[in-house]
Structure formats: C-alpha cells, structure tokens
C-alpha cells in the first residue's frame, strides 16, 4: 500500500473498493480564442466566497474582489492572456468608487490596460465578460474603431491601439 507522505485511509475490517471514477465536466471553453464560459458551479463558488474572500499574496482586496497591478508592459492581448492564465481577467470597472480605488493604487501616470475593447462584431465597446460599457458612467476618449483597446490614465478611459504596450491590472 502507498503510505509515506500522503494520507492513507486503510480499512482494517472488510474489503475496500479501489474503483476510481472520472467525470469530465465543465471544460474550459474558449470563444474565438478569447473569452471563457464560466461554469455555474465555479461562479456560485466564487460568489458565495465574496463576503469572506482572502486574496493571494501580491493581490489587493477591494469590495470582495482581488486586484493585481503589473510592473512590466505588454500589449492588450498579451495582458489579457496573462490574467487568463491566472484564473483572472483584465480589470472591469463597475463604478467611480472602484475607479478611485484603482487610481489610488496606481503608482504612475502612464496608461494602464483594462478589460475593455472595441469589438468589430458588435461595433461597440465591450468588457471582457461580454457586458457593454455603461455610457452614463464612463466616457471613452479617442476613436471607437477596430483594433482599439481601453487604457486608464488619471481616472479617465482612453482608446488606444491594442498592440501598444502598457502596464495592466488583473482582477478576480
């Protein structure tokens, strides 16, 4: 029997089945090579933990979410993938209070990528979770055209070329 550094549960009376069942459910799905479909189970798990969420080391907590501020610079798509690989996403800003928190923690005045880009399919600015931008809350300075991605600077949102390299913010 495999003992050593694991936890071995041994039944000393009766016989124990060794059958292992695998279930392949809730696969990671990628639409057009980008956005994920988050499973209901995962979503519920994350939502229920919101009240008592503890962030990882290097991440900042604000209103039940965790934020990570990069020190290096990447294009929007590379930043997007970087966050995705850490089970997070580029920053989605919900209100001005969150914008204020972000601004307070940005240590420089340069552009920073957020999870907002202009999708030629919808011909609109869309957050990485698929939701449209609320034009009542946010105004984007600059062109709304293909290959435009959003960056923040001094609490304002700017349209920039997606291939430009800036710092970025991940959120989960």
């Amino acid at each position: 029997l495999l003992v050593s550094q694991g936890v071995l549960l041994k039944c000393q009376k009766g016989s124990c089945s060794n059958a292992t069942q695998y279930e392949d459910t809730g696969d990671l799905k990628v639409n057009n090579g980008t956005r994920r479909n988050i499973s209901n189970k995962d979503l519920c798990a994350s939502r229920s933990a919101d009240q008592t969420v503890l962030c990882q080391s290097e991440w900042l907590k604000y209103q039940g979410k965790c934020y990570w501020f990069s020190n290096e610079m990447k294009s929007w798509s590379d930043s997007y993938v970087y966050c995705l690989e850490r089970k997070s996403h580029l920053l989605i800003i919900h209100d001005q209070l969150e914008m204020a928190f972000i601004q307070k923690n940005l240590r420089q005045l340069n552009y920073v990528w957020i999870g907002l880009n202009f999708t030629s399919l919808k011909m609109t600015w869309t957050w990485v979770d698929g939701s449209p931008i609320d034009s009542k809350i946010f105004f984007i300075k600059g062109p709304a055209k293909e290959n435009s991605c959003a960056a923040i600077k001094e609490s304002k949102i700017f349209s920039e070329t997606c291939s430009s390299v800036f710092k970025w913010i991940c959120q989960y």
């Epitope: 695998y22 279930e23 392949d24 459910t25 809730g26 696969d27 990671l28 990628v30 090579g33 994920r36 479909n37 988050i38 499973s39 995962d42 979503l43 798990a45 994350s46 933990a49 969420v53 503890l54 962030c55 990882q56 080391s57 290097e58 991440w59 965790c66 990570w68 590379d78 993938v81 970087y82 690989e85 850490r86 089970k87 997070s88 989960y172």
Partner: antibody, heavy 116, light 110 residues
Framework: SLEESGGDLVQPEGSLTLTCTAS????????MCWVRQAPGKGLEWIGC????????TYYASWAKGRFTITKTSSTTVTLQMTSLTAADTATYFC?????????????WGPGTLVTV | DVVMTQTPASVEAAVGGTVTIKCQAS??????LSWYQQKPGQPPKLLIY???TLESGVPSRFKGSGSGTEFTLTISDLECADAATYYC????????????FGGGTEVVVK
C-alpha cells in the same frame, strides 16, 4: 482521457522524453501539467504548460533547467528530462486543468514509470 | 516558492467516524486549493477545488473549508471506499505560477 508513454529504464546522467497523449479533446487552451511520485512517496509537481497562443511554461524550482515541457501537437505534450539521477525514479503523471474560476485538475493519465 | 504543509502525520478513525486533515500554505493563496484522493496503483482523483467546491460525483461527506493560509478537508461518515491517500495542492497567482502539493498524513480507519 490522457495517457503517458515513454517510461523506461535509463542510466544515470541519461535523458528521456515522456509523451502525454489526449483522447477525446484537443489542447486548444488548457493548462497541462506533469506530476511525479517516487515509489512509496508523495506527489511532486514538476511543471505546467499553457497550450494556447502564449505557450507559457512554469516549473518547480528544482525542475528548472533539467525538465522541459513542450506542446508537440494538438493532442500531445512532452516532458524532456536530462541529467537523470536515481532520485528521478518515479511514476510520472500528466494532468489537465478544466477550471475557469479555480484550477481544477480533474483528468489524469494512469502514469508511466521511469527507473534510473 | 509557496510551501504546503499537511498535518497531522498520522491519524486513526473508526468506520462511521470523522477525519480532519489540515493543510497550511506558507503564504496566502486565497481559495486556490484542491484536495485529491489517491488509491494504490491509481492516479489521484480530484475531490475538491477552490478550497470548498465539490467536484462532480464526489459524495457530500467530503467537505473542504478555509482560505488564505489555513485549509481543512473533513471526511465524515467514513466508509471503506474512503480508504486512500489524500493530498492538498495549492496554486499561486503571482508572476510565476506554482502548484505545490502537501506532504500528507496517514489515516487508519479502524
């Protein structure tokens, strides 16, 4: 499902390449990892590769330099091992992450034995 | 690198009883912790991910809790089928991602 192959008896200081082959899905955008287990010992994480466009790889500190994970096709990932010693004798497993909010390694291969 | 420490080294419990396994991370890993069950000659099987989310098909007798640096796996109403080796695995979301395993604890079901 996943299946590892390439396990063998190898001489000290030798090299070996293990292959992880997927059935029923393609490595489009998954995190694939290698884990090993020495006889009678616990599980030890070796490293992972993201099979999407980035191809990012991450390794345990002890594995850096000697172990290399590569995506070789849409259904295969390899683990190249060099400068092998008796301490590398273990069953080597490959596993796939299927989580979204959290990491979720719910598919594992049966393992392949490497003896140095 | 983050280090996962599983305790106790050994524990005994009776059939129908309860087993509690603890896992401690050397730094905060939020809720990024999984628990696995491994039976001799087989690969590990995922039980719990995200510290507390039960994997499909896993009985509700298995319960994961904790966040930050302290985590617990509780197995209640112990059955013969629970005879296995149990491991925790943490993950870091920092610039270099790590997936270390805990060393584990031996549990004997009497």
């Amino acid at each position: 499902s996943l299946e590892e192959s390439g396990g063998d008896l190898v001489q000290p200081e030798g090299s070996l390449t293990l292959t992880c082959t997927a059935s029923g899905f393609f490595f489009s955008s998954y995190c694939m990892c290698w884990v090993r287990q020495a006889p009678g010992k616990g599980l030890e994480w070796i490293g992972c590769i993201y099979t999407g466009s980035s191809g990012s790889t991450y390794y345990a500190s002890w594995a850096k330099g000697r172990f290399t994970i590569t995506k070789t096709s849409s259904t295969t990932v390899t683990l190249q091992m060099t400068s092998l010693t008796a301490a590398d004798t273990a069953t080597y497993f490959c596993t796939r992450d299927a989580g979204t909010t959290y990491w979720r390694y719910n598919i594992w291969g049966p393992g392949t034995l490497v003896t140095v | 690198d983050v280090v996962m420490t599983q305790t106790p080294a050994s524990v005994e419990a009776a059939v129908g009883g309860t087993v509690t396994i603890k896992c401690q991370a050397s730094q905060s890993i939020g809720s990024d912790l999984s628990w696995y069950q491994q039976k001799p000659g087989q690969p590990p099987k995922l039980l719990i991910y995200g510290a507390s989310t039960l994997e499909s098909g896993v009985p509700s007798r298995f319960k994961g809790s904790g966040s930050g640096t302290e985590f617990t796996l509780t197995i209640s109403d112990l059955e013969c089928a629970d005879a296995a080796t149990y491991y925790c695995q943490g993950t870091t979301r920092s610039s270099s991602i790590y997936w270390p395993f805990g060393g584990g604890t031996e549990v004997v079901v009497k």
